[in-house]
Interface confidence: medium
C-alpha cells in the first residue's frame, strides 16, 4: 500500500523559518502534490502550495518556496512573520495524487522538543487512502 511521509523542521539559523518535507513511498508516478496546514486538504486545512511535475508550482503566504526534491518528494519553505512562532504547534499535511488512480495524504508537525535544525523521523500517518 502506498504511503506518504511528512517531516517538519525548524531552521537552525532562523528560528522563524520552517521547512516541510514530504515524500511518496509506492509505485506509480505522482501527478500533483498539495500541501496544507491546520488539517487535511478539504477537511479544514488551508492550502499552502500545489506542485505539478511539469506545469510548475503555485504557493500562497506564508509559503516561501516550494520545490521538488526528487520525483516523489517535495519541500516547502515557510516564513513565520509573527514573533510567537505559530508553526510550532501546527499540523502540516501533504496529499500526493496520481491521476486517476487515487490520492494519499498524511500529516505531521514539529516535534514538541525539537532542537533547531533537527528533523523528526519520517513517520507516516495516513489520513486518506485511495479505495
Amino acid at each position: 500500500t502506498p504511503e506518504v511521509w511528512v517531516q517538519v523542521q525548524m531552521e537552525a539559523t532562523e528560528l522563524s523559518s520552517f521547512t516541510v518535507h514530504c515524500g511518496f513511498l509506492g509505485p506509480g508516478s505522482i501527478s500533483l502534490v498539495t500541501v496544507s496546514w491546520g488539517g487535511p486538504d478539504g477537511a479544514g486545512g488551508t492550502k499552502l502550495a500545489v506542485l505539478h511535475p511539469e506545469l510548475g508550482t503555485r504557493q500562497w503566504a506564508p509559503a516561501r518556496q516550494a520545490r521538488w526534491e526528487t520525483q516523489s518528494s517535495i519541500s516547502l519553505a515557510l516564513e513565520d512573520s509573527g514573533a510567537s512562532s505559530p508553526f510550532a504547534n501546527t499540523t502540516f499535511c501533504c496529499k500526493f495524487a496520481s491521476f486517476p488512480e487515487g490520492s494519499w495524504e498524511s500529516c505531521g508537525s514539529l516535534p514538541p522538543s525539537s532542537d533547531p535544525g533537527l528533523s523528526a523521523p519520517p513517520t507516516p500517518v495516513p489520513i486518506l487512502r485511495a479505495d
Epitope: L32, G42, H52, L55, R58, A97, F99, P100, G102
Partner: antibody
Framework: EVQLVESGGGLVKPGGSLKLSCAAS????????MSWVRQTPAKRLESVAT????????YYPDTVKGRFTVSRDNAKNTLYLQMSSLRSEDTAMYYC?????????????WGQGTSVTVSS | QIVLTQSPAIMSASPGEKVTMTCSAS?????MYWYQQKPGSSPRLLIY???NLASGVPVRFSGSGSGTSYSLTISRMEAEDAATYYC?????????FGAGTKLELK
C-alpha cells in the same frame, strides 16, 4: 480558444463497432489527460474512458472494460474511442473532456458531443 | 466505486431566492466538482476541489463540504441558473457523477 469537436457517432446494430474522434485545438493537447464521458437518454453522466497526457495509461469502468479502447495521437491533437461489441445500453451522447491539472483534474472543457444509438 | 446521491432530484426557486442542493458520497471523497448543464448544451464546470469557482462563474455560486457530504449553494437565484447540476468525484478510478438536481425557475 479551447475547442473540442467530437465526430463519428451514428446508428449501429447490437454487436457492432464504432470509432469516435475528438479534435482538440487552442491548447497544448499533449499536456492534458482526457476522458470520454457519456450521457444516457435518462440524462445520467458516466465516465467511460480516461487516458493520461502521454497516452500510455488508460482507465475504464467495468461496464466497458474489454469492449472500449481509448487512444490519442498527440501529433494530430486527436483523441479516439474505439467501441466494439456494442449493446443497447451504450446508447448515449458521447463527450470528450479535458482534465486540467491545476483545477485538480476537473473537466474544464467539454466538446459538443456526438450521438451514438445502438439499435436493431 | 463511489456512489454519489444528489438531493433533491428536482427543485424550483424564485428569482432572488437562496438555493442549496446536496451531494452525498458512499465513502470519503478526495476531490469534488460541480457542473451545470442546460438543455441542448454540454456540461460546464462550476466548482472544482469542493469550493473553488471555475473561471467566469458568478460569485453567487459557492461550494462546501468534506468527507462524504457536499453542497452547492446559489446565494440569489437568477433566471439563467435554471439548469441541471451534477456533482462528480475523483478519489480513485472510476470517476463518478451524481444523477443530478434539476433546478427550475418558479
Amino acid at each position: 480558444e479551447v475547442q473540442l469537436v467530437e465526430s463519428g457517432g451514428g446508428l449501429v446494430k447490437p454487436g457492432g463497432s464504432l470509432k469516435l474522434s475528438c479534435a482538440a485545438s487552442g491548447f497544448t493537447f499533449s499536456s492534458f489527460a482526457m476522458s470520454w464521458v457519456r450521457q444516457t437518454p435518462a440524462k445520467r453522466l458516466e465516465s467511460v474512458a480516461t487516458i493520461n497526457n502521454g497516452g500510455i495509461n488508460t482507465y475504464y469502468p467495468d461496464t466497458v472494460k474489454g469492449r472500449f479502447t481509448v487512444s490519442r495521437d498527440n501529433a494530430k491533437n486527436t483523441l479516439y474511442l474505439q467501441m466494439s461489441s456494442l449493446r443497447s445500453e451504450d446508447t448515449a451522447m458521447y463527450y470528450c473532456a479535458r482534465h486540467d491539472d491545476f483545477l485538480y483534474y476537473a473537466m474544464d472543457y467539454w466538446g459538443q458531443g456526438t450521438s451514438v444509438t445502438v439499435s436493431s | 466505486q463511489i456512489v454519489l446521491t444528489q438531493s433533491p432530484a428536482i427543485m424550483s426557486a424564485s428569482p432572488g431566492e437562496k438555493v442549496t442542493m446536496t451531494c452525498s458520497a458512499s465513502s470519503s471523497v478526495s476531490y469534488m466538482y460541480w457542473y451545470q448543464q442546460k438543455p441542448g448544451s454540454s456540461p460546464r464546470l462550476l466548482i472544482y476541489d469542493t469550493s473553488n469557482l471555475a473561471s467566469g462563474v458568478p460569485v453567487r455560486f459557492s461550494g462546501s463540504g468534506s468527507g462524504t457530504s457536499y453542497s452547492l449553494t446559489i446565494s440569489r437565484m437568477e433566471a439563467e441558473d435554471a439548469a441541471t447540476y451534477y456533482c462528480q468525484q475523483w478519489t480513485s478510478y472510476p470517476l463518478t457523477f451524481g444523477a443530478g438536481t434539476k433546478l427550475e425557475l418558479k
